[in-house]
Interface confidence: low
C-alpha cells in the first residue's frame, strides 16, 4: 500500500506516534517519506547482507527476522514480512521500540539527513487529524 501523506499522518496518530518519546507526528511522516516514499512494501538490501523493510525501513539485522540475515537479533520479535503489511501496526510497534533504544530517531538515517532540524510540521499541514 502506498499511503497518502495525510492518510499516513492520521494512521500514525491513531497508533500513538504523535509526540512519542518527544517526536512530533511531522517527524514520523517525514521519516516515512524519505525512507520508503510512503510505501509499506518498500525493501532495500544493505551491503552487510541485511534488508530494510516497510514504511519505516526497519532493519533485519537488529529488529525483525527474515530468516536470511546472519546474526539477526530480532529485537521486535516479529517476522520482517509483517512490516510489509498495509496495516502499519507492526511497523509502528517496532518503531516505538527502536526510538526508545537510546539514539531516538537518529536510528533512521533518512530522518537524520532529511528531516532533523527542518520544518517537519509541514508534513502534516492541511491534514484533518
Amino acid at each position: 500500500k502506498v499511503f497518502g501523506r495525510c492518510e499516513l499522518a492520521a494512521a500514525m496518530k491513531r497508533h500513538g506516534l504523535d509526540n512519542y518519546r518527544g517526536y512530533s507526528l511531522g517527524n514520523w511522516v517525514c521519516a516515512a517519506k524519505f525512507e520508503s516514499n510512503f510505501n509499506t512494501q518498500a525493501t532495500n538490501r544493505n551491503t552487510d547482507g541485511s534488508t530494510d523493510y516497510g514504511i519505516l525501513q526497519i532493519n533485519s539485522r537488529w529488529w525483525c527476522n527474515d530468516g536470511r540475515t546472519p546474526g539477526s537479533r530480532n529485537l521486535c520479535n516479529i517476522p520482517c514480512s509483517a512490516l510489509l503489511s498495509s496495516d502499519i501496526t507492526a511497523s509502528v510497534n517496532c518503531a516505538k521500540k527502536i526510538v526508545s533504544d537510546g539514539n531516538g530517531m537518529n536510528a533512521w538515517v533518512a530522518w537524520r539527513n532529511r528531516c532533523k532540524g527542518t520544518d517537519v510540521q509541514a508534513w502534516i499541514r492541511g491534514c484533518r487529524l
Partner: antibody, heavy 115, light 107 residues
Framework: QVQLQESGAEVMKPGASVKISCKAT????????IEWVKQRPGHGLEWIGE????????YYNEKFKGKATFTADTSSNTAYMQLSSLTSEDSAVYYC?????????WGQGTTLTVS | DIELTQSPATLSVTPGDSVSLSCRAS??????LHWYQQKSHESPRLLIK???QSMSGIPSRFSGSGSGTDFTLSINSVETEDFGMYFC?????????FGGGTKLEIK
C-alpha cells in the same frame, strides 16, 4: 498448504526467449521472496536470484544478469522468470522456491531444452 | 562468492551403515548452512536448516553439525529410501550458493 506450481516443459530454438511461471498458493504471496534455481546434470544447483512480489524488488546473481528477468503478478499470485538469448547452456531444469534463507517449499521444476 | 565443497563426491554404502557427508565453505558462514536430499526427477527436499535444526517429518536418523567452515550431515543406519543426492547450501551471503553434491548409492 503451501504449493508452488511451475509451468510445463519447453523446447526452444537458440536465440529465442522463454517465460517460465510459478503459481503460489497457500500463503501470502506478496510477503515472501520467490527464488529461482537452475539445475544442469553435472553442474549441481545454481541460485539465479529472487523477487519479492509485493514490492517488485529483485536481486540477481551476477552470473545471470542480462540472462534472467523476474516479474510477479500479485493478482494471480504468479511469479515469472524470462530467459533471453537462449543457448544450449540454458538447457536445464529450473525451480522456483519460497525463500526463507533456506528453501522448504519448491516447485516441481520446469525442464527447458534448447536445440 | 562463497564456495561450498562437498566430499566425497560418491559414497557407496550398505543399508544399515552409518555415514557422514562433509561440506566445507571457502570462508566462515557461521551456522547458515542447510542440507537437502534430492532423488532422481524430484525437487530437492530440505532436511536440516541452520546446521542442526531438523525439519518436521524428517526421520531422526538425519542430523547435522559443525560451524564456521566445516559442516557434517550424519545418517545413522542408512535405509534404502535414503539413497540419492545430497546438497548443502549457504545463506550467509549473496549470491546463495550450493555444494556440488554427494551421491549416496547402494554398494
Amino acid at each position: 498448504q503451501v504449493q508452488l506450481q511451475e509451468s510445463g516443459a519447453e523446447v526452444m530454438k537458440p536465440g529465442a526467449s522463454v517465460k517460465i511461471s510459478c503459481k503460489a498458493t497457500g500463503y501470502t504471496f506478496t510477503t515472501y521472496w520467490i527464488e529461482w534455481v537452475k539445475q544442469r546434470p553435472g553442474h549441481g544447483l545454481e541460485w539465479i536470484g529472487e523477487i519479492l512480489p509485493g514490492s517488485g524488488s529483485t536481486y540477481y546473481n551476477e552470473k545471470f544478469k542480462g540472462k534472467a528477468t523476474f516479474t510477479a503478478d500479485t493478482s494471480s499470485n504468479t511469479a515469472y522468470m524470462q530467459l533471453s538469448s537462449l543457448t544450449s547452456e540454458d538447457s536445464a531444469v529450473y525451480y522456483c522456491a519460497r525463500g526463507d534463507g533456506h528453501y522448504y517449499y519448491w516447485g516441481q521444476g520446469t525442464t527447458l531444452t534448447v536445440s | 562468492d562463497i564456495e561450498l565443497t562437498q566430499s566425497p563426491a560418491t559414497l557407496s554404502v550398505t543399508p544399515g551403515d552409518s555415514v557422514s557427508l562433509s561440506c566445507r565453505a571457502s570462508q566462515s558462514i557461521s551456522n547458515n548452512l542447510h542440507w537437502y536430499q534430492q532423488k532422481s526427477h524430484e525437487s530437492p527436499r530440505l532436511l536440516i536448516k541452520y546446521t542442526s535444526q531438523s525439519m518436521s517429518g524428517i526421520p531422526s536418523r538425519f542430523s547435522g553439525s559443525g560451524s564456521g567452515t566445516d559442516f557434517t550431515l550424519s545418517i545413522n543406519s542408512v535405509e534404502t529410501e535414503d539413497f540419492g543426492m545430497y546438497f548443502c547450501q549457504q545463506s550467509n551471503s549473496w549470491p546463495r550458493t550450493f555444494g556440488g553434491g554427494t551421491k549416496l548409492e547402494i554398494k
